[in-house]
Interface confidence: low
């Protein structure tokens, strides 16, 4: 049936709305800075490294490289930094900044991602003395995403960018269920159209099981809201057990009286005020 | 401009002691380990001993192990080397560098200060 | 301790001529962070030395592109091209990967 495609077109208009950030993030308008920050968005599954690379220009001789992450207050809390002379790491070690051989290029990454790293990243360069200078790259935003198990052979895999986001999830669910009224009108006009006298009360039988086993129709029966909660929870969930990485616990800020959502996680490092991290010296005579 | 000025050298008997002092300016001394290098008259570079920035991690070539003592005032931007049980050996030019293991590494070099170890 | 092996020890050029220098290290100067530390140093008499290039490649700020590094694991090479006079010095490599540091005995670089 012709119908069947009737809510993809809707998701696929919806994804392609979902880049909109990207375009701000890319806009031809911004001001040339001499640092990048690459890729300007990027998604990937809980428990997946995500790894963004910072570009200097040309090679300085004294700086210092700072990644931050824009907090829910715009204010820019420091998740670790590289030193001509050391790797500074964070308080939380998942952040990990590493020089590329070219010398210009640094990888910024952070091990085992979390649904609540979501967010928006920049990285800072300070130019030391006798040229003093400070520069900071383009936001780049970073979403990561709720492990799904592997669907069922007969289920059609999610559409990319919708799991774990809420509202990319409501319209998905949405346009399924719109699907399936068109469907149910279809069978309706179609119904109406044949005469039922040759096949009698079976024909609407017949043409409804169909409707429940189909693929398209899949999401509606299975989807358990409670898997949408996520958002809201408190506390990072546990993905499931053949899926979990095995990782260090780390503790997270709850900000009581309000959701927890991705935009708002406090990273231990941004607790830190004033007081630097403690030292760490590069390859050579002390490996980290 | 990154500066690093050694003083300190000087003749001394062997059994002797002497304490180099390296001031640094031009950045952030407290970012940065230090190292002194030394190169014995017309022979190559040795690294002697290092520092972290903290002072908290050192390290010492085997053969002034237990002689030699690196430490650093970070408020004062200076590093020092003690040297004692001086052996005629230890006769050389020693330099002062920054960086201690390091991309950047052996970046900038003081003028160094020459001691002599003689009877 | 890493051995630095460098050739020739002496080497004498003309001006206008290109002249390479051999650095060989008895393990590999990689790093698991993909960067290679080797530098390149000259000193000139009476005078400290000056760094030239690190990791293996990178000029150090006002050294003109006359200097080229290359080079990879063990075996690195250091061309001066267009030699002229100022050129002349002794020239180290050394690696700042393992402990301790080590350099090269020195290339004595003279002008013919």
């Known amino acids: 049936m012709g119908s069947r495609r009737g809510p993809w077109p809707l998701v696929w208009a919806v994804l392609q709305l979902g880049w909109w950030p990207g375009w701000l993030l890319d806009s031809p308008d911004r001001p040339w800075s001499p640092l990048t920050f690459s890729p300007a968005q990027l998604t990937v599954q809980e428990g997946e490294n995500a790894t963004f690379t910072c570009s200097l220009a040309d090679i300085p001789d004294s700086f210092v490289l700072n990644w931050y992450r824009l907090s829910p207050r715009n204010q820019t809390d420091k998740l670790a930094a590289f030193q001509e002379d050391r790797i500074e790491p964070g308080r939380d070690r998942r952040f990990r900044v590493t020089r590329l051989p070219n010398g210009r290029d640094f990888h910024m990454s952070i091990v085992a991602a979390r649904l609540n790293d979501s967010g928006i990243y920049l990285c800072g360069a300070i130019y030391l003395p006798p040229n003093t200078q400070i520069n900071e790259s383009p936001r780049a935003e970073l979403s990561v995403t709720e492990r799904t198990l592997e669907p069922p052979t007969q289920s059609p895999s999610p559409p990319p960018r919708l799991s774990g986001q809420l509202q990319g999830l409501v319209i998905g669910v949405t346009s399924v269920l719109v699907g399936v009224l068109l469907l149910l009108l279809l069978t309706w006009v179609l119904a109406a159209v044949f005469p039922r006298a040759t096949r009698g009360a079976c024909v609407c039988g017949s043409e409804d099981e169909p409707l429940k086993e189909g693929p398209d129709a899949a999401p509606v029966f299975t989807l358990d809201y409670g898997e949408l909660d996520f958002q809201w929870r408190e506390k990072t969930p546990e993905p499931p057990a053949p899926c979990a990485p095995e990782q260090t616990e780390y503790a997270t800020i709850v900000f009581p009286g309000r959701p927890a959502s991705p935009g708002r996680r406090a990273s231990a490092s941004s607790l830190q005020g004033a007081q630097p991290p403690s030292p760490e010296d590069g390859p050579g005579l002390w490996p980290p | 401009e990154v500066q690093l000025v050694e003083s300190g050298g000087d003749l001394v008997k062997p059994a002797g002691s002497l304490r180099l002092s390296c001031l640094a300016s031009?950045?952030?001394?407290?970012?940065?380990?230090m190292s002194w290098v030394r190169q014995a008259p017309e022979k190559g570079l040795h690294l002697v001993a290092g520092?972290?920035?903290?002072?908290?991690?050192?390290y010492y070539k085997d053969a002034v192990k237990g002689r030699f003592t690196i430490s650093r005032d970070n408020a004062k931007s200076i590093v020092y080397l003690q040297m004692n049980s001086l052996r005629v050996e230890d006769t050389a030019m020693y330099y002062c560098?920054?960086?201690?293991?390091?991309?950047?590494?052996?970046?900038?070099w003081g003028q160094g200060t020459l001691v002599t170890v003689s009877s | 301790d890493v051995v630095m092996t460098q050739t020739p020890l002496s080497l004498s050029v003309s001006p206008g001529e290109t002249a390479s220098i051999s650095c060989k290290a008895s393990?590999?100067?990689?790093?698991?962070?993909?960067?290679?530390?080797l530098t390149w140093f000259r000193q000139k008499p009476g005078q400290s030395p000056h760094r030239l290039v690190y990791?293996?490649?990178h000029r150090h700020p006002g050294v003109p592109d006359r200097f080229s590094g290359s080079g990879s694991g063990t075996d690195f090479t250091l061309r001066i091209s267009r030699v002229e006079a100022d050129d002349t010095g002794l020239y180290y490599c050394?690696?700042?990967?393992?402990?301790?540091?080590?350099f090269g005995a020195g290339t004595k670089v003279e002008l013919k």
């Open positions: 031009g950045f952030t001394f407290s970012s940065y380990s």
């Open positions: 393990q590999s100067l990689l790093h698991s962070d993909g960067n290679t530390y």
């Open positions: 050394g690696q700042v990967i393992h402990d301790p540091w080590t």
């Open positions: 560098v920054r960086g201690f293991s390091s991309f950047n590494g052996l970046g900038y």
């Open positions: 520092i972290n920035s903290d002072g908290d991690r050192t």
């Open positions: 990791a293996v490649s």
